[in-house]
Amino acid sequence: QGCGEDKICQSNLQLVRARFCTRVSDTEFQPLPMDVDGTTALFALSGQPVIGLELMVTNLPSDPAQPQADGDDAHEAQLLVMLPDSLHYSGVRALDPAEKPLCLSNENASHVECELGNPMKRGAQVTFYLILSTSGISIETTELEVELLLATISEQELHPVSARARVFIELPLSIAGMAIPQQLFFSGVVRGERAMQSERDVGSKVKYEVTVSNQGQSLRTLGSAFLNIMWPHEIANGKWLLYPMQVELEGGQGPGQKGLCSPRPNILHLDVDSRDR
Amino acid sequence: ELEPPEQQEPGERQEPSMSWWPVSSAEKKKNITLDCARGTANCVVFSCPLYSFDRAAVLHVWGRLWNSTFLEEYSAVKSLEVIVRANITVKSSIKNLMLRDASTVIPVMVYLDPMAVVAE
Protein backbone atom coordinates (compact mmCIF):
# COMPACT_ATOMS: atom_id res chain seq x y z
CA GLN A 1 0.00 0.00 0.00
CA GLY A 2 1.33 3.47 -0.92
CA CYS A 3 4.15 2.03 -3.01
CA GLY A 4 2.87 2.49 -6.55
CA GLU A 5 2.27 -0.07 -9.26
CA ASP A 6 5.71 -1.70 -8.99
CA LYS A 7 5.01 -2.52 -5.31
CA ILE A 8 8.48 -1.20 -4.45
CA CYS A 9 8.44 1.74 -2.04
CA GLN A 10 10.69 4.40 -3.53
CA SER A 11 10.41 7.31 -1.16
CA ASN A 12 11.79 10.80 -1.64
CA LEU A 13 12.44 12.10 1.84
CA GLN A 14 14.00 15.53 1.69
CA LEU A 15 15.21 17.78 4.46
CA VAL A 16 14.20 20.98 2.74
CA ARG A 17 14.93 23.26 5.67
CA ALA A 18 17.34 23.13 8.58
CA ARG A 19 17.91 26.51 10.14
CA PHE A 20 18.73 27.80 13.58
CA CYS A 21 16.18 29.98 15.35
CA THR A 22 15.63 32.06 18.43
CA ARG A 23 12.81 30.84 20.64
CA VAL A 24 10.23 33.61 21.05
CA SER A 25 7.58 31.66 22.98
CA ASP A 26 6.82 28.01 23.70
CA THR A 27 5.94 27.18 20.09
CA GLU A 28 7.13 30.32 18.28
CA PHE A 29 10.57 30.61 16.73
CA GLN A 30 12.33 33.24 14.61
CA PRO A 31 15.20 32.44 12.23
CA LEU A 32 18.59 33.74 13.29
CA PRO A 33 20.19 36.36 11.05
CA MET A 34 22.51 34.92 8.41
CA ASP A 35 26.21 35.52 7.93
CA VAL A 36 27.35 37.17 4.70
CA ASP A 37 27.81 33.74 3.12
CA GLY A 38 24.03 33.23 3.31
CA THR A 39 24.34 29.67 4.64
CA THR A 40 25.64 30.16 8.18
CA ALA A 41 23.43 31.52 10.94
CA LEU A 42 24.72 34.01 13.50
CA PHE A 43 24.10 33.10 17.11
CA ALA A 44 24.65 35.73 19.80
CA LEU A 45 25.48 34.21 23.14
CA SER A 46 23.73 36.68 25.41
CA GLY A 47 21.62 34.84 27.91
CA GLN A 48 19.64 32.62 25.51
CA PRO A 49 19.18 29.34 27.38
CA VAL A 50 18.08 27.48 24.25
CA ILE A 51 18.37 27.66 20.49
CA GLY A 52 15.79 26.24 18.10
CA LEU A 53 16.55 24.20 15.01
CA GLU A 54 13.73 24.43 12.49
CA LEU A 55 13.40 21.30 10.38
CA MET A 56 11.11 20.75 7.43
CA VAL A 57 10.86 17.28 5.93
CA THR A 58 8.85 16.39 2.83
CA ASN A 59 8.05 13.21 0.94
CA LEU A 60 7.06 14.49 -2.48
CA PRO A 61 7.79 13.21 -5.99
CA SER A 62 11.10 14.60 -7.23
CA ASP A 63 9.51 15.25 -10.63
CA PRO A 64 5.85 16.33 -10.53
CA ALA A 65 5.60 15.29 -14.19
CA GLN A 66 6.46 11.71 -13.21
CA PRO A 67 4.82 11.30 -9.79
CA GLN A 68 5.04 7.51 -9.89
CA ALA A 69 8.83 7.46 -10.11
CA ASP A 70 9.32 8.18 -6.41
CA GLY A 71 7.70 9.89 -3.43
CA ASP A 72 6.12 6.61 -2.26
CA ASP A 73 5.37 6.02 1.42
CA ALA A 74 8.54 6.15 3.52
CA HIS A 75 8.35 3.30 6.00
CA GLU A 76 9.97 3.76 9.40
CA ALA A 77 10.89 7.32 8.44
CA GLN A 78 13.31 8.83 10.91
CA LEU A 79 15.54 11.83 11.34
CA LEU A 80 18.81 11.15 13.14
CA VAL A 81 20.42 14.15 14.82
CA MET A 82 24.02 14.30 16.01
CA LEU A 83 24.74 17.24 18.30
CA PRO A 84 28.10 18.83 19.16
CA ASP A 85 29.33 18.89 22.77
CA SER A 86 28.12 22.47 23.08
CA LEU A 87 24.44 21.61 22.49
CA HIS A 88 22.07 19.24 24.27
CA TYR A 89 18.63 18.08 23.22
CA SER A 90 15.84 19.33 25.48
CA GLY A 91 12.64 18.94 23.50
CA VAL A 92 10.70 19.30 20.28
CA ARG A 93 7.88 21.62 19.26
CA ALA A 94 5.59 22.01 16.28
CA LEU A 95 3.15 24.80 15.56
CA ASP A 96 0.53 22.10 15.13
CA PRO A 97 0.88 19.29 17.66
CA ALA A 98 -0.28 16.78 15.05
CA GLU A 99 3.03 17.45 13.29
CA LYS A 100 5.14 16.98 16.38
CA PRO A 101 7.31 13.92 15.88
CA LEU A 102 8.33 11.59 18.65
CA CYS A 103 11.95 12.46 19.42
CA LEU A 104 13.99 10.46 21.88
CA SER A 105 17.55 11.16 22.92
CA ASN A 106 20.37 9.16 24.41
CA GLU A 107 21.51 9.51 28.02
CA ASN A 108 23.70 12.58 27.49
CA ALA A 109 21.27 14.21 25.02
CA SER A 110 23.87 14.32 22.23
CA HIS A 111 22.10 12.01 19.81
CA VAL A 112 18.41 12.27 18.91
CA GLU A 113 16.11 10.05 16.87
CA CYS A 114 12.86 11.53 15.64
CA GLU A 115 10.15 9.25 14.28
CA LEU A 116 8.50 10.90 11.31
CA GLY A 117 5.80 8.30 10.76
CA ASN A 118 5.47 4.69 9.84
CA PRO A 119 4.97 5.32 7.07
CA MET A 120 5.55 8.97 6.29
CA LYS A 121 3.00 9.09 3.53
CA ARG A 122 3.33 10.22 -0.06
CA GLY A 123 2.81 13.98 -0.19
CA ALA A 124 3.46 14.46 3.52
CA GLN A 125 5.22 17.56 4.78
CA VAL A 126 6.15 18.28 8.40
CA THR A 127 7.78 21.23 10.10
CA PHE A 128 9.03 21.05 13.65
CA TYR A 129 11.61 22.60 15.94
CA LEU A 130 14.25 20.86 18.00
CA ILE A 131 14.93 22.73 21.21
CA LEU A 132 18.62 22.61 22.03
CA SER A 133 20.09 23.72 25.33
CA THR A 134 22.99 26.16 24.93
CA SER A 135 24.37 25.52 28.42
CA GLY A 136 27.37 23.75 26.91
CA ILE A 137 28.44 26.77 24.86
CA SER A 138 31.52 28.42 26.30
CA ILE A 139 33.36 31.58 25.33
CA GLU A 140 35.69 29.36 23.30
CA THR A 141 32.80 28.06 21.12
CA THR A 142 33.01 29.68 17.72
CA GLU A 143 30.69 27.44 15.69
CA LEU A 144 27.70 25.17 16.14
CA GLU A 145 27.33 22.27 13.74
CA VAL A 146 24.46 19.80 13.87
CA GLU A 147 24.58 16.75 11.61
CA LEU A 148 21.23 15.52 10.32
CA LEU A 149 20.44 12.28 8.54
CA LEU A 150 17.09 11.10 7.23
CA ALA A 151 16.49 7.35 7.29
CA THR A 152 13.87 4.95 5.97
CA ILE A 153 13.58 1.26 5.11
CA SER A 154 11.95 2.27 1.83
CA GLU A 155 14.21 2.49 -1.21
CA GLN A 156 16.10 5.76 -1.13
CA GLU A 157 19.71 6.88 -0.97
CA LEU A 158 20.16 9.39 1.83
CA HIS A 159 23.13 11.54 2.84
CA PRO A 160 23.88 13.57 5.96
CA VAL A 161 23.28 17.30 5.98
CA SER A 162 24.76 19.88 8.36
CA ALA A 163 23.17 22.94 9.92
CA ARG A 164 25.73 25.54 10.97
CA ALA A 165 25.77 28.66 13.09
CA ARG A 166 28.65 30.98 13.90
CA VAL A 167 28.73 31.86 17.57
CA PHE A 168 29.69 35.32 18.70
CA ILE A 169 29.63 36.63 22.22
CA GLU A 170 27.77 39.88 22.32
CA LEU A 171 28.64 41.84 25.40
CA PRO A 172 25.39 43.24 26.74
CA LEU A 173 26.94 46.54 27.69
CA SER A 174 25.11 49.80 27.23
CA ILE A 175 26.41 53.30 27.73
CA ALA A 176 24.59 56.56 28.39
CA GLY A 177 25.85 60.02 29.18
CA MET A 178 24.66 63.40 30.36
CA ALA A 179 26.11 66.84 31.01
CA ILE A 180 25.19 69.07 33.94
CA PRO A 181 24.31 71.71 32.95
CA GLN A 182 23.52 71.22 29.28
CA GLN A 183 24.02 74.91 28.52
CA LEU A 184 27.13 76.93 29.36
CA PHE A 185 27.90 80.64 29.09
CA PHE A 186 31.08 82.64 28.66
CA SER A 187 31.76 86.34 29.25
CA GLY A 188 34.17 88.70 31.00
CA VAL A 189 37.80 89.35 30.14
CA VAL A 190 40.60 87.36 28.55
CA ARG A 191 43.21 85.97 30.99
CA GLY A 192 46.43 84.13 30.27
CA GLU A 193 47.06 80.53 31.27
CA ARG A 194 49.71 81.55 33.82
CA ALA A 195 47.20 83.79 35.54
CA MET A 196 45.08 80.80 36.43
CA GLN A 197 45.42 79.73 40.05
CA SER A 198 42.10 78.10 40.82
CA GLU A 199 39.68 76.25 38.64
CA ARG A 200 37.20 79.06 39.29
CA ASP A 201 39.50 81.34 37.30
CA VAL A 202 39.04 79.20 34.19
CA GLY A 203 35.36 79.53 33.37
CA SER A 204 31.94 77.95 33.75
CA LYS A 205 31.89 74.55 35.41
CA VAL A 206 30.46 71.46 33.74
CA LYS A 207 30.09 67.89 34.98
CA TYR A 208 29.77 64.85 32.74
CA GLU A 209 28.31 61.59 33.94
CA VAL A 210 28.75 58.47 31.81
CA THR A 211 26.95 55.34 32.99
CA VAL A 212 27.86 51.87 31.75
CA SER A 213 25.36 49.09 32.41
CA ASN A 214 26.05 45.39 32.13
CA GLN A 215 22.96 43.20 31.65
CA GLY A 216 24.96 40.01 31.32
CA GLN A 217 27.57 37.98 33.16
CA SER A 218 30.50 39.51 34.99
CA LEU A 219 33.13 40.81 32.61
CA ARG A 220 35.93 39.13 34.55
CA THR A 221 35.44 35.96 32.51
CA LEU A 222 35.68 37.73 29.18
CA GLY A 223 38.62 40.06 29.37
CA SER A 224 39.28 43.63 30.43
CA ALA A 225 37.00 46.48 29.50
CA PHE A 226 37.82 50.16 29.27
CA LEU A 227 35.53 53.13 29.44
CA ASN A 228 36.96 55.89 27.28
CA ILE A 229 35.93 59.50 27.15
CA MET A 230 37.01 61.64 24.22
CA TRP A 231 37.52 64.97 25.90
CA PRO A 232 37.77 68.01 23.60
CA HIS A 233 40.53 69.80 25.48
CA GLU A 234 41.57 72.19 22.72
CA ILE A 235 40.31 73.82 19.56
CA ALA A 236 42.01 73.33 16.22
CA ASN A 237 44.60 76.04 16.83
CA GLY A 238 45.75 74.53 20.12
CA LYS A 239 43.97 76.83 22.56
CA TRP A 240 42.22 75.37 25.57
CA LEU A 241 38.56 74.44 25.08
CA LEU A 242 37.38 72.31 28.01
CA TYR A 243 39.80 72.05 30.90
CA PRO A 244 39.65 68.63 32.61
CA MET A 245 39.75 69.05 36.39
CA GLN A 246 38.88 65.66 37.80
CA VAL A 247 38.06 62.19 36.44
CA GLU A 248 36.60 59.58 38.76
CA LEU A 249 35.17 56.15 38.11
CA GLU A 250 32.60 54.81 40.53
CA GLY A 251 31.94 51.07 40.36
CA GLY A 252 33.78 48.68 38.09
CA GLN A 253 36.64 48.40 40.58
CA GLY A 254 35.09 46.20 43.23
CA PRO A 255 32.96 47.29 46.22
CA GLY A 256 33.48 50.87 47.37
CA GLN A 257 36.63 51.44 45.33
CA LYS A 258 37.19 54.46 43.10
CA GLY A 259 38.98 53.82 39.84
CA LEU A 260 41.94 55.63 38.39
CA CYS A 261 41.82 56.76 34.79
CA SER A 262 44.70 57.79 32.62
CA PRO A 263 46.10 60.23 31.78
CA ARG A 264 45.70 62.29 34.95
CA PRO A 265 43.57 65.43 34.50
CA ASN A 266 44.30 68.93 35.82
CA ILE A 267 47.81 69.08 34.34
CA LEU A 268 48.10 72.76 35.35
CA HIS A 269 47.54 71.71 38.99
CA LEU A 270 44.87 74.32 39.55
CA ASP A 271 43.29 74.53 42.97
CA VAL A 272 40.15 72.43 43.18
CA ASP A 273 37.00 74.20 44.26
CA SER A 274 35.68 71.77 46.88
CA ARG A 275 32.22 73.36 46.72
CA ASP A 276 31.81 71.88 43.25
CA ARG A 277 32.22 68.22 44.19
CA GLU B 1 36.97 48.59 18.82
CA LEU B 2 38.63 46.01 21.04
CA GLU B 3 41.90 47.71 22.04
CA PRO B 4 42.27 50.61 24.50
CA PRO B 5 43.09 53.81 22.64
CA GLU B 6 46.52 55.40 22.55
CA GLN B 7 46.91 58.03 25.27
CA GLN B 8 47.52 61.63 24.39
CA GLU B 9 48.90 64.11 26.93
CA PRO B 10 47.69 67.69 26.62
CA GLY B 11 50.77 69.88 26.08
CA GLU B 12 51.78 73.09 27.85
CA ARG B 13 49.73 76.01 26.58
CA GLN B 14 51.03 79.29 25.15
CA GLU B 15 49.91 82.67 26.48
CA PRO B 16 46.80 83.71 24.57
CA SER B 17 47.55 85.97 21.61
CA MET B 18 45.48 87.36 18.83
CA SER B 19 44.36 84.30 16.88
CA TRP B 20 45.63 83.63 13.39
CA TRP B 21 42.01 82.53 12.73
CA PRO B 22 40.29 85.85 12.02
CA VAL B 23 37.09 86.72 13.83
CA SER B 24 35.47 87.44 10.51
CA SER B 25 35.55 83.72 9.63
CA ALA B 26 33.79 82.87 12.89
CA GLU B 27 31.25 85.58 12.26
CA LYS B 28 30.22 83.88 9.07
CA LYS B 29 29.51 80.71 11.03
CA LYS B 30 26.73 81.64 13.37
CA ASN B 31 26.49 78.08 14.76
CA ILE B 32 29.67 76.11 15.31
CA THR B 33 30.20 72.52 16.41
CA LEU B 34 33.41 71.62 18.17
CA ASP B 35 33.85 67.89 17.77
CA CYS B 36 37.02 65.81 17.59
CA ALA B 37 35.32 63.32 15.28
CA ARG B 38 34.84 66.11 12.75
CA GLY B 39 38.30 67.55 13.22
CA THR B 40 37.03 70.82 14.69
CA ALA B 41 38.59 70.10 18.08
CA ASN B 42 41.41 68.02 19.50
CA CYS B 43 40.76 65.41 22.13
CA VAL B 44 42.58 63.79 24.97
CA VAL B 45 41.25 60.32 25.68
CA PHE B 46 40.73 59.43 29.31
CA SER B 47 40.69 55.68 29.62
CA CYS B 48 39.30 53.98 32.71
CA PRO B 49 39.75 50.25 33.21
CA LEU B 50 36.64 48.36 34.33
CA TYR B 51 38.21 45.57 36.31
CA SER B 52 35.33 44.02 38.21
CA PHE B 53 32.19 44.94 36.41
CA ASP B 54 28.96 43.19 37.33
CA ARG B 55 26.11 45.65 36.91
CA ALA B 56 26.95 49.34 36.51
CA ALA B 57 29.78 51.83 36.60
CA VAL B 58 29.58 55.62 36.50
CA LEU B 59 32.33 57.89 35.23
CA HIS B 60 32.28 61.44 36.61
CA VAL B 61 34.29 64.09 34.81
CA TRP B 62 34.44 67.62 36.10
CA GLY B 63 35.63 70.32 33.76
CA ARG B 64 35.72 74.02 33.11
CA LEU B 65 34.97 75.92 29.96
CA TRP B 66 38.14 77.85 29.07
CA ASN B 67 36.54 81.28 29.11
CA SER B 68 39.42 83.17 27.49
CA THR B 69 39.45 80.99 24.38
CA PHE B 70 35.76 81.56 23.82
CA LEU B 71 36.10 85.32 24.29
CA GLU B 72 39.00 85.43 21.83
CA GLU B 73 37.67 83.07 19.22
CA TYR B 74 33.90 82.92 19.42
CA SER B 75 32.54 86.16 20.85
CA ALA B 76 30.80 86.90 17.56
CA VAL B 77 29.30 83.40 17.29
CA LYS B 78 25.62 82.89 17.99
CA SER B 79 26.01 79.43 19.56
CA LEU B 80 28.55 76.65 19.90
CA GLU B 81 27.98 72.98 20.38
CA VAL B 82 30.75 71.16 22.21
CA ILE B 83 30.70 67.38 21.76
CA VAL B 84 32.07 64.90 24.26
CA ARG B 85 32.09 61.27 23.16
CA ALA B 86 32.37 58.13 25.27
CA ASN B 87 32.73 54.49 24.38
CA ILE B 88 33.59 51.09 25.77
CA THR B 89 36.43 48.99 24.43
CA VAL B 90 37.35 45.47 25.40
CA LYS B 91 40.76 43.87 25.34
CA SER B 92 40.29 40.11 25.06
CA SER B 93 41.87 37.02 23.59
CA ILE B 94 38.38 35.89 22.58
CA LYS B 95 38.11 36.35 18.83
CA ASN B 96 34.31 36.15 18.60
CA LEU B 97 33.59 38.93 21.05
CA MET B 98 31.29 41.70 19.85
CA LEU B 99 30.16 45.01 21.31
CA ARG B 100 27.04 46.65 20.00
CA ASP B 101 26.00 50.30 20.52
CA ALA B 102 28.78 50.80 23.06
CA SER B 103 29.18 54.52 22.47
CA THR B 104 27.40 57.72 23.35
CA VAL B 105 27.55 61.39 22.37
CA ILE B 106 27.05 64.16 24.93
CA PRO B 107 26.47 67.62 23.50
CA VAL B 108 26.68 70.87 25.46
CA MET B 109 25.56 74.21 24.08
CA VAL B 110 27.76 77.26 24.75
CA TYR B 111 26.59 80.86 24.41
CA LEU B 112 28.06 84.32 24.93
CA ASP B 113 26.41 85.83 27.98
CA PRO B 114 27.27 89.52 28.46
CA MET B 115 25.38 89.58 31.77
CA ALA B 116 27.19 86.59 33.36
CA VAL B 117 30.07 86.68 35.81
CA VAL B 118 32.99 84.73 34.44
CA ALA B 119 33.60 82.28 37.31
CA GLU B 120 30.07 81.16 38.16
Epitope: G91, A98, L102, C103, L104, Q125 | -
Partner: antibody, heavy 121, light 112 residues
Protein backbone atom coordinates in the same frame (compact mmCIF):
# COMPACT_ATOMS: atom_id res chain seq x y z
CA UNK C 1 -1.39 -4.83 29.64
CA UNK C 2 -1.62 -1.09 29.04
CA UNK C 3 -3.24 0.59 32.03
CA UNK C 4 -3.90 4.05 33.43
CA UNK C 5 -4.74 4.03 37.13
CA UNK C 6 -6.07 7.24 38.65
CA UNK C 7 -6.13 8.50 42.23
CA UNK C 8 -9.27 8.24 44.36
CA UNK C 9 -12.32 10.49 44.67
CA UNK C 10 -11.88 13.93 46.24
CA UNK C 11 -14.24 16.33 48.02
CA UNK C 12 -13.05 19.92 47.91
CA UNK C 13 -14.22 23.33 49.09
CA UNK C 14 -14.84 26.17 46.62
CA UNK C 15 -11.65 28.21 46.03
CA UNK C 16 -9.34 25.33 46.86
CA UNK C 17 -7.25 23.16 44.52
CA UNK C 18 -7.25 19.49 43.60
CA UNK C 19 -4.43 17.38 42.15
CA UNK C 20 -5.38 14.18 40.36
CA UNK C 21 -2.75 11.59 39.49
CA UNK C 22 -2.66 9.05 36.68
CA UNK C 23 -0.10 6.22 36.81
CA UNK C 24 0.74 4.61 33.49
CA UNK C 25 1.98 1.06 33.04
CA UNK C 26 2.46 -1.50 30.29
CA UNK C 27 3.94 0.92 27.73
CA UNK C 28 6.72 3.48 27.24
CA UNK C 29 5.40 6.54 29.07
CA UNK C 30 7.30 9.09 26.97
CA UNK C 31 6.04 7.77 23.63
CA UNK C 32 2.46 9.03 24.06
CA UNK C 33 0.76 12.29 24.98
CA UNK C 34 -1.34 12.26 28.13
CA UNK C 35 -4.72 13.97 27.81
CA UNK C 36 -7.14 15.08 30.50
CA UNK C 37 -10.87 15.07 29.87
CA UNK C 38 -13.71 15.77 32.29
CA UNK C 39 -17.37 14.83 32.40
CA UNK C 40 -19.84 16.68 34.60
CA UNK C 41 -22.69 14.53 36.03
CA UNK C 42 -25.01 13.49 33.20
CA UNK C 43 -23.10 15.68 30.74
CA UNK C 44 -20.80 15.25 27.76
CA UNK C 45 -17.01 15.15 27.57
CA UNK C 46 -14.84 18.26 27.80
CA UNK C 47 -11.16 18.28 26.84
CA UNK C 48 -8.94 20.05 29.40
CA UNK C 49 -5.52 19.69 27.85
CA UNK C 50 -2.58 17.40 27.19
CA UNK C 51 1.07 17.01 28.07
CA UNK C 52 3.95 15.35 26.25
CA UNK C 53 5.88 13.39 28.89
CA UNK C 54 9.06 13.37 26.79
CA UNK C 55 9.62 17.12 27.13
CA UNK C 56 6.66 18.37 29.21
CA UNK C 57 5.12 20.39 26.38
CA UNK C 58 1.62 21.34 27.46
CA UNK C 59 -1.37 22.37 25.39
CA UNK C 60 -4.42 23.60 27.30
CA UNK C 61 -7.98 24.40 26.38
CA UNK C 62 -8.29 28.20 26.73
CA UNK C 63 -11.14 27.63 29.19
CA UNK C 64 -8.67 26.12 31.64
CA UNK C 65 -5.55 28.11 30.83
CA UNK C 66 -5.48 30.06 34.09
CA UNK C 67 -6.52 27.23 36.39
CA UNK C 68 -5.15 23.91 35.11
CA UNK C 69 -1.57 22.75 35.49
CA UNK C 70 -0.38 19.54 33.86
CA UNK C 71 2.83 17.87 35.00
CA UNK C 72 4.56 14.52 34.71
CA UNK C 73 7.02 12.52 36.73
CA UNK C 74 8.95 10.39 34.26
CA UNK C 75 10.64 8.38 36.99
CA UNK C 76 7.29 6.97 38.15
CA UNK C 77 5.43 7.21 34.80
CA UNK C 78 2.80 9.36 36.45
CA UNK C 79 0.88 12.32 35.05
CA UNK C 80 -0.81 14.94 37.21
CA UNK C 81 -3.58 17.43 36.64
CA UNK C 82 -4.03 20.22 39.16
CA UNK C 83 -7.09 22.45 39.01
CA UNK C 84 -7.16 25.56 41.18
CA UNK C 85 -9.83 28.08 42.25
CA UNK C 86 -12.43 25.32 42.29
CA UNK C 87 -16.09 26.16 41.89
CA UNK C 88 -19.21 24.01 42.10
CA UNK C 89 -19.31 23.73 38.29
CA UNK C 90 -16.01 21.85 38.45
CA UNK C 91 -17.77 18.88 40.03
CA UNK C 92 -17.08 16.13 37.49
CA UNK C 93 -15.33 12.88 36.76
CA UNK C 94 -11.81 13.64 35.54
CA UNK C 95 -10.22 11.18 33.12
CA UNK C 96 -6.67 10.80 31.91
CA UNK C 97 -6.39 9.29 28.44
CA UNK C 98 -3.38 8.16 26.43
CA UNK C 99 -3.02 10.02 23.16
CA UNK C 100 -1.21 8.81 20.07
CA UNK C 101 1.76 10.59 18.59
CA UNK C 102 1.96 12.13 15.17
CA UNK C 103 0.18 11.26 11.95
CA UNK C 104 -2.79 8.94 12.11
CA UNK C 105 -2.64 7.77 15.74
CA UNK C 106 -4.17 11.02 16.88
CA UNK C 107 -6.80 9.60 19.25
CA UNK C 108 -7.34 8.49 22.84
CA UNK C 109 -6.91 4.74 22.87
CA UNK C 110 -6.61 4.02 26.59
CA UNK C 111 -8.56 5.76 29.37
CA UNK C 112 -8.14 5.81 33.13
CA UNK C 113 -11.02 4.72 35.35
CA UNK C 114 -11.84 8.34 36.24
CA UNK C 115 -11.59 10.37 39.43
CA UNK C 116 -14.72 11.99 40.85
CA UNK C 117 -14.03 15.47 42.18
CA UNK C 118 -16.86 17.00 44.17
CA UNK C 119 -16.74 20.71 44.94
CA UNK C 120 -19.06 21.60 47.79
CA UNK C 121 -19.14 24.02 50.66
CA UNK D 1 -13.60 26.18 18.65
CA UNK D 2 -15.00 23.48 16.40
CA UNK D 3 -18.53 22.56 17.47
CA UNK D 4 -19.54 18.92 17.09
CA UNK D 5 -23.26 18.27 16.75
CA UNK D 6 -24.66 14.75 17.11
CA UNK D 7 -28.06 13.38 16.23
CA UNK D 8 -30.20 11.83 17.41
CA UNK D 9 -29.87 12.50 21.14
CA UNK D 10 -31.48 9.16 21.91
CA UNK D 11 -31.66 6.05 19.75
CA UNK D 12 -33.90 3.12 20.79
CA UNK D 13 -33.02 0.03 18.70
CA UNK D 14 -34.26 -3.52 18.51
CA UNK D 15 -31.46 -6.14 18.83
CA UNK D 16 -30.35 -7.36 15.42
CA UNK D 17 -31.48 -4.13 13.71
CA UNK D 18 -29.07 -1.59 12.25
CA UNK D 19 -28.39 1.77 13.85
CA UNK D 20 -26.94 4.97 12.51
CA UNK D 21 -25.61 8.04 14.34
CA UNK D 22 -24.77 11.32 12.62
CA UNK D 23 -22.07 13.79 13.59
CA UNK D 24 -21.59 17.19 12.01
CA UNK D 25 -18.68 19.58 12.61
CA UNK D 26 -18.85 23.37 12.36
CA UNK D 27 -15.83 23.34 10.04
CA UNK D 28 -13.90 20.86 7.94
CA UNK D 29 -11.93 18.28 9.89
CA UNK D 30 -9.38 17.68 7.12
CA UNK D 31 -5.99 18.49 8.60
CA UNK D 32 -3.37 20.12 6.40
CA UNK D 33 -1.43 16.85 6.55
CA UNK D 34 -4.31 15.18 4.71
CA UNK D 35 -5.67 13.20 7.66
CA UNK D 36 -9.18 13.66 9.01
CA UNK D 37 -9.12 13.38 12.77
CA UNK D 38 -12.69 12.30 13.50
CA UNK D 39 -13.15 9.52 16.04
CA UNK D 40 -15.99 7.64 17.72
CA UNK D 41 -16.09 6.57 21.37
CA UNK D 42 -18.55 4.47 23.32
CA UNK D 43 -19.14 5.02 27.02
CA UNK D 44 -20.94 2.07 28.54
CA UNK D 45 -22.93 2.68 31.74
CA UNK D 46 -20.61 3.29 34.70
CA UNK D 47 -17.45 2.94 32.59
CA UNK D 48 -14.81 5.15 30.99
CA UNK D 49 -15.12 5.94 27.29
CA UNK D 50 -13.52 3.45 24.87
CA UNK D 51 -12.29 4.00 21.34
CA UNK D 52 -14.30 2.41 18.52
CA UNK D 53 -13.31 4.17 15.29
CA UNK D 54 -10.39 6.52 14.56
CA UNK D 55 -9.62 8.63 11.50
CA UNK D 56 -13.25 8.46 10.24
CA UNK D 57 -13.30 4.80 9.27
CA UNK D 58 -10.52 2.80 10.95
CA UNK D 59 -11.73 0.24 13.45
CA UNK D 60 -9.67 0.14 16.64
CA UNK D 61 -8.15 -3.18 17.72
CA UNK D 62 -10.71 -5.56 19.16
CA UNK D 63 -13.75 -3.63 17.91
CA UNK D 64 -16.32 -5.93 16.20
CA UNK D 65 -16.70 -5.49 12.46
CA UNK D 66 -20.40 -4.62 12.85
CA UNK D 67 -19.16 -1.09 13.65
CA UNK D 68 -18.19 1.10 10.71
CA UNK D 69 -17.50 4.76 10.18
CA UNK D 70 -17.81 6.94 7.11
CA UNK D 71 -17.99 10.55 5.97
CA UNK D 72 -15.74 13.40 4.98
CA UNK D 73 -15.24 17.11 5.53
CA UNK D 74 -17.94 18.05 8.01
CA UNK D 75 -20.43 15.15 7.85
CA UNK D 76 -19.76 11.78 9.46
CA UNK D 77 -21.72 8.68 10.33
CA UNK D 78 -21.28 5.73 12.67
CA UNK D 79 -23.17 2.61 11.66
CA UNK D 80 -23.87 -0.56 13.62
CA UNK D 81 -25.00 -3.24 11.17
CA UNK D 82 -26.73 -5.40 13.80
CA UNK D 83 -27.14 -3.99 17.29
CA UNK D 84 -26.41 -6.27 20.21
CA UNK D 85 -27.37 -5.83 23.87
CA UNK D 86 -23.75 -5.07 24.82
CA UNK D 87 -23.74 -2.04 22.52
CA UNK D 88 -25.85 0.07 24.87
CA UNK D 89 -24.31 3.28 26.15
CA UNK D 90 -23.54 6.79 25.00
CA UNK D 91 -21.72 7.27 21.68
CA UNK D 92 -19.54 10.33 21.28
CA UNK D 93 -17.90 11.68 18.16
CA UNK D 94 -14.73 13.75 18.68
CA UNK D 95 -12.34 15.82 16.60
CA UNK D 96 -8.63 16.24 17.13
CA UNK D 97 -7.87 18.24 13.99
CA UNK D 98 -7.79 21.58 15.77
CA UNK D 99 -7.13 22.69 19.33
CA UNK D 100 -9.05 22.60 21.57
CA UNK D 101 -10.21 19.07 20.85
CA UNK D 102 -13.97 18.83 21.11
CA UNK D 103 -16.61 16.15 21.58
CA UNK D 104 -20.16 15.83 20.37
CA UNK D 105 -22.95 15.98 22.95
CA UNK D 106 -23.46 12.22 22.77
CA UNK D 107 -26.12 9.83 21.47
CA UNK D 108 -27.69 7.40 23.93
CA UNK D 109 -28.32 4.02 22.37
CA UNK D 110 -30.86 1.88 24.23
CA UNK D 111 -32.42 -1.46 23.52
CA UNK D 112 -36.15 -1.42 22.79
Amino acid sequence: EVQLVQSGAEVKKPGSSVKVSCKASGYSFTRYWMHWVRQAPGQGLEWIGKIDPSDSETRLNQEFRDRATLTVDKSTSTAYMELSSLRSEDTAVYYCARGGYFGEKWYHDVWGQGTLVTVSS
Amino acid sequence: DIVMTQSPLSLPVTPGEPASISCRSSQSLVHRNGNTYLHWYLQKPGQSPQLLIYGVSNRFAGVPDRFSGSGSGTDFTLKISRVEAEDVGVYFCAQSTQLPYTFGGGTKLEIK
